[in-house]
C-alpha cells in the first residue's frame, strides 16, 4: 500500500519527541498512601514528548490524524504520545482481611507511540 | 481499592472534553487518490476534545499521569484523548494484480478514552 | 513459579573483582515494585542486605558497600548481576539473590553460592 | 542504621510445646500507615532463609498458621503454637523501615 511509515528519528532534537520518561512518586503524591504499604517510593515510566509528523504513528489511524492536523490544525489535533504497552508492577496493599500482593497491568508505561 | 474512578461528565462545558468528532476527508486529503478507489469520500470519526482531572481515564496509568500532571504540570503531560477502540472500514483498492476489497481494523475510532 | 540460581566463580584473587550473576526463571524480571536483590552471609554468621536493583534500573545499595558495589539487570537473558572490587577474606561469604517487594518480602531466593576470596 | 537485636541467641525446644522468639529494633519500625515494617525469616540447616512473617503480624504464603507475629514499634515476637522437628534452624528479624534492611543476628531453634 502507499500508506507513509512512522518514523523513528526526532526532527525536533533529542528528547523533544514521544519517549519514555522515568518519574519519581511517593505514595502522598498518589493519593494512595492510604492503602499501598509497599513499595513506597514508585518509579513510574510515562509517555511525554511530541509527535511531529509520522513519528511513531500507533496505526493508519494516527497516520491519518497527523496528515489531516496539517490540513487542518484547528479542528484536528495532532497524535498525542501514549503508552503503547506496559510493565506489570506488584503492590502490597491492605485488603478488608489483612494485607495482599497483586499485580497491576495497566500501571507503569513500558512503550511509547503516537495516536 | 482507592483507586478514583474516572468520571464521564465534562467539567470544561458541552463538546469541550474529549469525544468521538466525524471529520469528513477525500482521497486526495489523505493522499490516498493514487491507491484507494472506494469510497471517494471518508467520513473518519477522530478523537478530540480536552481531558480534564479524571475524565474518562483509559486505565490506571492514566489517572496517576492525571494527579501528577496536576502536581508537576510542566514535567508530567496531561492525558489526551484517543481512540479506544475503532470500526472496521472496507476500502476498494489497486493491487499489483489488479483490484481488491481489504478491510483495515485501525483506520476510523470508534470510541475514546483519556490516557 | 519463580527461581532463582546464582552463578559465578567461587574463588576470587584479593584485590580482584567478585562478579556474581542471578537467572530469574518462571517469571520477568521487568516486574514494577519488584527489588532484585543480593544478600550475603558470612561463614556461620548472620544476614547482610547488599542491594538492589528495580525493574527501571534504580539501584540501592548498603552504605557499607556502596564504594564497591555495581549491580544491574539485563531483561533481555532475565538476569541481573552483582560486581563487588578491591575484595578482601572479609568479603568471603554465601551469596544469595532474592526477590523483594521493594526492600522488603524476600519471598524467593537463589540457593546461594559460596564464594572464597584466596590467593 | 536500624540496629536489630534478637534473643534467646539459642532457644532448645521440645515438639508439640510453644516457642517464643523476642526482636527489639533500636528505633521504631511503625510507619504512619499503622503498620510496622518488619519481616520474621527462617533458614533451615543447609538451606536459604525462607520468608515466614511481614509487616511485622502477616504470615506469607504457604506458612503454616502455627507461626505468628506480633508486636509494635521496637519491640517483637514471633511465636510458634507448637513446635514441629521441621521448625529447627536458625530465626532472623529484618527491620525493613527504611534503607539499608538490617537483619538481627539469629536464633537457633533446636530441638531438645
Known amino acids: 500500500s502507499a500508506h507513509a511509515h512512522p518514523r523513528d528519528s526526532c526532527p525536533l532534537g533529542p528528547g523533544r519527541c514521544c519517549h519514555l520518561e522515568t518519574v519519581q512518586a511517593t505514595l502522598e503524591d498518589l493519593g494512595w498512601s492510604d492503602w499501598v504499604l509497599s513499595p513506597r517510593q514508585l518509579q513510574l515510566s510515562m509517555c511525554v514528548g511530541e509527535c511531529p509528523h509520522l513519528y511513531r504513528s500507533a496505526n493508519t489511524h494516527a497516520q491519518i490524524k497527523a496528515r489531516l492536523h496539517g490540513l487542518q490544525p484547528d479542528k484536528v489535533p495532532a497524535p498525542c504520545c501514549v503508552p503503547s504497552s506496559y510493565t506489570p508492577v506488584v503492590l502490597m496493599h491492605r485488603t478488608d482481611s489483612g494485607v495482599s500482593l497483586q499485580t497491576y497491568d495497566d500501571l507503569v508505561a513500558r512503550g511509547c507511540h503516537c495516536a | 481499592s482507592a483507586h478514583a474512578h474516572p468520571r464521564d461528565s465534562c467539567p470544561l462545558g458541552p463538546g469541550r472534553c474529549c469525544h468521538l468528532e466525524t471529520v469528513q476527508a477525500t482521497l486526495e486529503d489523505l493522499g490516498w487518490s493514487d491507491w484507494v478507489l472506494s469510497p471517494r469520500q471518508l467520513q473518519l470519526s477522530m478523537c478530540v476534545g480536552e481531558c480534564p482531572h479524571l475524565y474518562r481515564s483509559a486505565n490506571t496509568h492514566a489517572q496517576i499521569k492525571a494527579r501528577l500532571h496536576g502536581l508537576q504540570p510542566d514535567k508530567v503531560p496531561a492525558p489526551c484523548c484517543v481512540p479506544s477502540s475503532y470500526t472496521p472500514v472496507v476500502l476498494m483498492h489497486r493491487t499489483d494484480s489488479g483490484v481488491s476489497l481489504q478491510t483495515y481494523d485501525d483506520l476510523v475510532a470508534r470510541g475514546c478514552h483519556c490516557a | 513459579q519463580v527461581q532463582l540460581q546464582e552463578s559465578g566463580p567461587g574463588l576470587v584473587k584479593p584485590s580482584q573483582t567478585l562478579s556474581l550473576t542471578c537467572t530469574v526463571s518462571?517469571?520477568?524480571?521487568?516486574?514494577?515494585?519488584?527489588?532484585w536483590t543480593w544478600i550475603r552471609q558470612h561463614p556461620g554468621k548472620g544476614l547482610e542486605w547488599i542491594g538492589a536493583?528495580?525493574?527501571?534500573?534504580?539501584?540501592y545499595y548498603n552504605p557499607s558497600l556502596e564504594s564497591r558495589v555495581t549491580i544491574s539487570v539485563d531483561t533481555s537473558k532475565n538476569q541481573f548481576s552483582l560486581k563487588l572490587s578491591s575484595v578482601t577474606a572479609a568479603d568471603t561469604a554465601v551469596y544469595y539473590c532474592a526477590r523483594g517487594i521493594e526492600y522488603q518480602h524476600f519471598d524467593y531466593w537463589g540457593q546461594g553460592t559460596l564464594v572464597t576470596v584466596s590467593s | 542504621d536500624i540496629v536489630m537485636t534478637q534473643s534467646p541467641l539459642s532457644l532448645p525446644v521440645t515438639p508439640g510445646e510453644p516457642a517464643s522468639i523476642s526482636c527489639r529494633s533500636s528505633q521504631s519500625l511503625l510507619h504512619s500507615n499503622g503498620y510496622n515494617y518488619l519481616d520474621w525469616y527462617l533458614q533451615k540447616p543447609g538451606q536459604s532463609p525462607q520468608l515466614l512473617i511481614y509487616l511485622g503480624s502477616n504470615r506469607a504464603s504457604g506458612v503454616p498458621d502455627r507461626f505468628s507475629g506480633s508486636g509494635s514499634g521496637t519491640d517483637f515476637t514471633l511465636k510458634i503454637s507448637r513446635v514441629e522437628a521441621e521448625d529447627v534452624g536458625v530465626y532472623y528479624c529484618?527491620?525493613?523501615?527504611?534503607?539499608?534492611?538490617?537483619f538481627g543476628g539469629g536464633t537457633k531453634v533446636e530441638i531438645k
Open positions: 536493583i528495580a525493574y527501571s534500573g534504580s539501584t
Open positions: 518462571g517469571g520477568s524480571i521487568s516486574s514494577g515494585g519488584i527489588y
Open positions: 529484618m527491620s525493613t523501615l527504611e534503607l539499608p534492611p538490617t
